[in-house]
């Protein structure tokens, strides 16, 4: 069977530029090592936002300078992207790869449209 990945269609970032969503995958095999990548698609260009490889049952570890954090529970990954601004509004795709043990499987979600609205600056108080 091919691997299916589900993620919400739309998420609104908080006023602090933080967006969270769940990426859930239907694993066809008993993977012990999983790689999760967040991709951003804009104007048909796809770029990598962040990636993490984790052992099942352990925490997701993104690079120290990553704008992503996450936790895993079974076949669910809870992803949080920080530091978002209005210009970062776009389609964020969850990509899941079952790396080990073989066989390798790829799963790509349909994407979550994240809307980011920059907060209005506070008016000067006299």
């Amino acid at each position: 069977k091919a691997m299916h990945v589900a993620q919400p269609a739309v998420v609104l970032a908080s006023s602090r530029g933080i967006a969270s969503f769940v990426c859930e995958y239907a694993s066809p095999g008993k993977a012990t090592e999983v790689r999760v990548t967040v991709l951003r698609q804009a104007d048909s260009q796809v770029t990598e936002v962040c990636a993490a490889t984790y052992m099942m049952g352990n925490e997701l570890t993104f690079l120290d300078d990553s704008i992503c954090t996450g936790t895993s529970s079974g076949n669910q990954v809870n992803l949080t992207i920080q530091g978002l601004r209005a210009m970062d509004t776009g389609l964020y795709i969850c990509k899941v790869e079952l790396m080990y043990p073989p066989p390798y499987y790829l799963g790509i979600g349909n994407g979550t449209q994240i809307y980011v609205i920059d907060p209005e600056p506070c008016p000067d108080s006299d």
């Epitope: 796809v46 990636a51 390798y104 790509i108």
Partner: antibody, heavy 118, light 107 residues
Framework: EVQLVESGGGVVEPGRSLRLSCAAS????????MHWVRQAPGKGLEWVAV????????DYADSAKGRFTISRDNSKNTLYLQMNSLRAEDTAVYYC???????????WGQGTLVTVSS | EIVLTQSPGTLSLSPGERATLSCRAS??????LAWYQQKPGQAPRPLIY???SRATGIPDRFSGSGSGTDFTLTISRLEPEDFAVYYC?????????FGPGTKVDIK
């Protein structure tokens, strides 16, 4: 600009070895899975091997298992295919290809011809 | 192993005509299907990925459709440069497999 350039092909006798190289440029090499695909003269495309983000994670086609070894040197942005115990049926053009962010093979090298003949 | 079957083996058409190429998988591959074009002496060139998304720089006369196990590549109006061999590929699981190809030649 993404570029993949294969080298190392040539004529070799059955049972001998050959090492192919693929020099990559224009992208962050270590962030991508890299593949070898071959094409026998007048035939279709056959996937040979892949090496993932960790150099220890590899997969091979049945026809390559036990004889071919894929490796990468991220510091040199280079992909390799060590081919041992070569047979006449290994005669083909060997392409390296990048596994794109969305999974399909988005960039290919120009290929290098390997001829196994006595 | 997922086996891909392409039909027809050869398609003889004239420039300006519509080409319809078929690819069938031995089991469901969701949307992890790509199409490549190859001309003699050249490397394959990606045309379509994810069943229906065009790769960078591919003209809109190329389109892909299908789901599950049955997929189609359509070239709405053949241009002289479109006469080539077309391969489908599944990339959703190991081992990655290609179809045997369909040759589109000039009638």
């Amino acid at each position: 600009e993404v570029q993949l350039v294969e080298s190392g092909g040539g004529v070799v006798e059955p049972g001998r070895s050959l090492r192919l190289s693929c020099a990559a440029s224009g992208f962050t090499f270590s962030s991508y899975g890299m593949h070898w695909v071959r094409q026998a003269p007048g035939k279709g495309l056959e996937w040979v091997a892949v090496i993932w983000y960790k150099p220890s994670e590899k997969d091979y086609a049945d026809s390559a298992k036990g004889r071919f070894t894929i490796s990468r040197d991220n510091s040199k942005n280079t992909l390799y295919l060590q081919m041992n115990s070569l047979r006449a049926e290994d005669t083909a053009v060997y392409y390296c290809a990048r596994g794109g962010l969305l999974g399909y093979f988005d960039y290919w090298g120009q290929g290098t011809l390997v001829t196994v003949s006595s | 192993e997922i086996v891909l079957t392409q039909s027809p083996g050869t398609l003889s058409l004239s420039p300006g005509e519509r080409a319809t190429l078929s690819c069938r998988a031995s089991q469901s591959i969701n949307s992890y299907l790509a199409w490549y074009q190859q001309k003699p002496g050249q490397a394959p060139r990606p045309l379509i990925y994810g069943v229906s998304s065009r790769a960078t720089g591919i003209p809109d006369r190329f389109s892909g459709s299908g789901s599950g196990t049955d997929f189609t590549l359509t070239i709405s109006r053949l241009e002289p440069e479109d006469f080539a061999v077309y391969y489908c590929q599944q990339y959703g699981r190991y081992p990655f497999t290609f179809g045997p190809g369909t040759k589109v030649d000039i009638k």
